[in-house]
């Protein structure tokens, strides 16, 4: 901040700029502001060692004019070296220097622990110019000191390419102990030893530590900070804290809860997210983890059919994301599903069982023993088959789909027929003579169309030929059967 002292004092905010002031011809003292950097590079003058009989750091500038006029040495006047005060109190300290006006251009700045104090710090620099010398008093004030204000403060004056450095002023802010490490909440195994750490600092030192468990002191004699408490083991939850004492008083740490690890609670809210013919997607809400992270979960699946053998299928999965798709299930089947999860201590009980059903699917196999006959008298092709095994129908049969392809002289035509669920034979009209007819049959449920059977071919001769034998589904591995009449 700056002030010109004439009839009145006018305070101005501080800025990190050039070193101001205004010399009036009447030589009245004037208050002005701090530091600004000029163009010049700077030479550092190290602070003198504490206790040296000397009034600050002297710089004898090397610059001289054409007439070789040496500039006189400059030094900050000695000031208080160490200030001890309590937290939240105010403090003001200063450095002063008399600068002959022949220097003509100076800047001054405050530094703390090697860093320049820029911005709106509470710094005021007073200037008292007269004909030959300008007296400069740079003051620094802190209205309510905090621990972070601890440190070494110096003034630097930049003048004619050099820096003059004041002796350091050490500010020591004393207060209640300040925790640098507090005990942390923990989850521990029953009857297993563990450690808690507490560390606090002053000033003032020393800082002594007492441990407290469930509101009772653990140690009768204090321990010097830092302190490590070894707890031999717990059988139930406990709350620990530590007290830090110094000459200014005591500070109590946060209370931390030490929990005993246990098996988890069973999952809740197992629900069906989606069902298909052969899979069920389930989700669940994990129960309480027993103060130990879940490791994995187990999904147990039982057929709900009273006639089933009661065997349980088990699917293991990771604990996250509380979602699992159970696969390899039968279509149109009912299942009971339960979930259990584990942590390092053990498995939870199984969740409440829920009922779930798979949906109807398309058959998984084609009709069996497909045979094809040519009935020349009626100009029809007779087709016969056996329905797929019930287990592989994956639903209730609603019929069959017959594909017959007619090929003759490079022309090919496919036709589709639908047949009701009760039949196991069909008759189709001959579409083309002197052609090959290829027949395939698929079973159909409400879940969809199953796979087609292997093709069976029969040759349809021109009118007047005789039908001697049927064509039938070949044994596996044989070439397509073709009956030529």
């Amino acid at each position: 901040a700056i002030t010109e002292a004439r009839e009145e004092a006018k305070p101005y905010p501080l800025f990190p700029g050039p070193f101001p002031g205004s010399l009036q011809t009447d030589h009245t003292p004037l208050l002005s502001l701090p530091h600004a950097s000029g163009y010049q590079p700077a030479l550092m003058f190290s602070p003198t060692q504490p206790g040296r009989p000397h009034t600050g750091n002297v710089a004898i500038p090397q610059v001289t004019s054409v007439e070789s006029k040496p500039l006189p040495p400059l030094a900050f006047k000695h000031t208080v070296g160490h200030i001890i005060l309590s937290e939240h109190k105010g403090v003001k300290f200063n450095c002063s220097i008399s600068v002959p006006n022949i220097y003509q251009d100076t800047t001054i700045s405050w530094w703390k622990d090697g860093k320049e104090l820029l911005g709106a710090h509470h710094a005021i620099t007073q200037f008292y110019p007269d004909d030959e010398v300008t007296a400069i008093i740079a003051s620094f004030s802190i209205t309510s000191v905090q621990r972070s204000d601890n440190g070494s403060y110096i003034c630097k004056m930049k003048i004619n390419n050099e820096e003059i450095v004041s002796d350091p002023i050490y500010i020591e802010v004393q207060g209640l102990p300040h925790f640098t490490k507090q005990p942390e909440s923990m989850n521990v195994t029953r009857n297993t030893a563990f450690n808690l750490t507490c560390q606090a600092v002053g000033p003032p030192e020393p800082v002594n530590i007492f441990w407290v468990q469930n509101s009772s002191r653990v140690n009768e004699q204090p321990e010097k900070s830092p302190s490590v408490l070894t707890v031999p083991g717990l059988t139930e939850m406990a709350v620990f804290s530590c007290e830090a004492h110094n000459d200014k008083g005591l500070t109590v740490s946060k209370g931390v809860q030490i929990n005993i690890k246990a098996i988890p609670s069973p999952p809740t809210e197992v629900s069906i997210r989606n069902s298909t013919a052969h899979s069920i997607l389930i989700s669940w809400v994990p129960g309480f983890d027993g103060y130990s992270p879940f490791r994995n979960c187990s999904i147990q699946v039982k057929e709900a059919d009273p006639l089933s053998n009661g065997s349980v299928m088990i699917f293991n999965t990771s604990a996250l994301p509380h979602l699992y798709q159970i696969k390899q299930l039968q279509a149109l089947a009912n299942y009971s599903i339960g979930v259990s999860c584990m942590n390092e201590i053990g498995w939870s009980a199984v969740s409440p069982w829920i009922l779930a059903s798979t949906t109807e699917g398309a058959p998984s196999v084609a009709p069996l023993n497909v045979t094809v006959f040519l009935n020349e008298s009626s100009d029809n092709v007779d087709i016969r088959w056996m329905k797929p095994p019930t287990k592989q129908q994956d639903g209730e049969l609603v019929g069959y789909r017959i594909s017959h392809v007619w090929q003759s002289a490079g022309i090919s035509k496919e036709l589709l027929e639908e047949v009701g669920q009760n039949g196991s034979r069909a008759r189709i009209s001959v579409q083309v003579h002197n052609a090959t007819c290829t027949v395939r049959i698929a079973a159909v449920t409400r879940g969809g169309v199953g796979p087609f059977s292997d093709p069976v071919k029969i040759f349809i001769p021109a009118h007047g030929w005789v039908d001697y034998a049927p064509s039938s589904t070949p044994a596996p591995g044989n070439a397509d059967p073709v009956l030529i009449i």
Partner: antibody
């Protein structure tokens, strides 16, 4: 009273040099820095640099480095500004101005100005 | 370099008016701003330094304010002799720089 008196107007050809003087009176010459500021016709103020009148050490603004020289004669309390290799855009009024104190960088006393005309 | 931008460049006002001229610095200059008045054919005159301190002999109708990057010069009641060009200057750091000027004319 404190005053700065500058030399008279100059007319120069492009490429020539000009030297402007500034005589101080009413104060101790070597206790105050001397700044030089110029002003082209109808334009604003442009700082050229300053000289420590005690040590003779100059500080030049980047735009003028290598083309300007500041000197002083303490026996006559006079500061000089020499500008070389004149161009048409150097046509301006050149002012000397006293730096207010050791701890300030503004100007409390100004010369009356010297008009420099550059014309072929 | 720190740029100083003045506004407005021209200002028309009448005797008795209150006028304000602003100056904006391109970076924080604290309070290190001064204001000069210049009349045609004359050298500039120091009005205000440290943003708000009036120089010796400057009438109290002139006042300055601001800190950091924004500064103002206010003339509370214009007098005939106040019609001139006004310049701000920063002296936070070298090179010293001026605003481009504000010409105050009679309306």
């Amino acid at each position: 009273q404190v005053q700065l008196v500058q030399s008279g107007a100059e007319v120069k050809k492009p490429g020539a040099s000009v030297k402007v003087s500034c005589k101080a009176s009413g104060y101790t010459f070597t206790n105050y820095g001397m700044n030089w500021v110029r002003q082209a016709p109808g334009q604003g103020l442009e700082w050229m640099g300053w000289i420590n009148t005690y040590t003779g050490e100059p500080t030049y603004a980047d735009d003028f480095k290598g083309r300007v020289t500041f000197t002083t004669d303490t026996s006559t309390s006079t500061a000089y500004m020499e500008l070389r290799s004149l161009r048409s855009d150097d046509m301006a009024v050149y002012y000397c101005a006293r730096k207010s104190t050791v701890v300030s960088r503004y100007f409390d006393v100004w010369g009356q100005g010297t008009t420099v005309t550059v014309s072929s | 370099d720190i740029q100083m931008t003045q506004s407005p460049s021209f200002l028309s006002a009448s005797v008795g008016d209150r006028v304000t001229i602003t100056c904006k610095a391109s970076q924080d200059v604290g309070d290190a701003v001064t204001w000069y008045q210049q009349k045609p054919g004359k050298a500039p005159k120091l009005l205000i330094y440290w943003a708000s301190t009036r120089h010796t002999g400057v009438p109290d109708r002139f006042s300055g304010s601001g800190s950091g990057t924004d500064f103002t010069l206010t003339i509370s009641s214009l007098q005939p002799e106040d019609f001139a060009t006004y310049y701000c200057q920063q002296y936070r750091s070298y090179p010293l720089t001026f605003g481009q000027g504000t010409k105050l004319e009679i309306k």
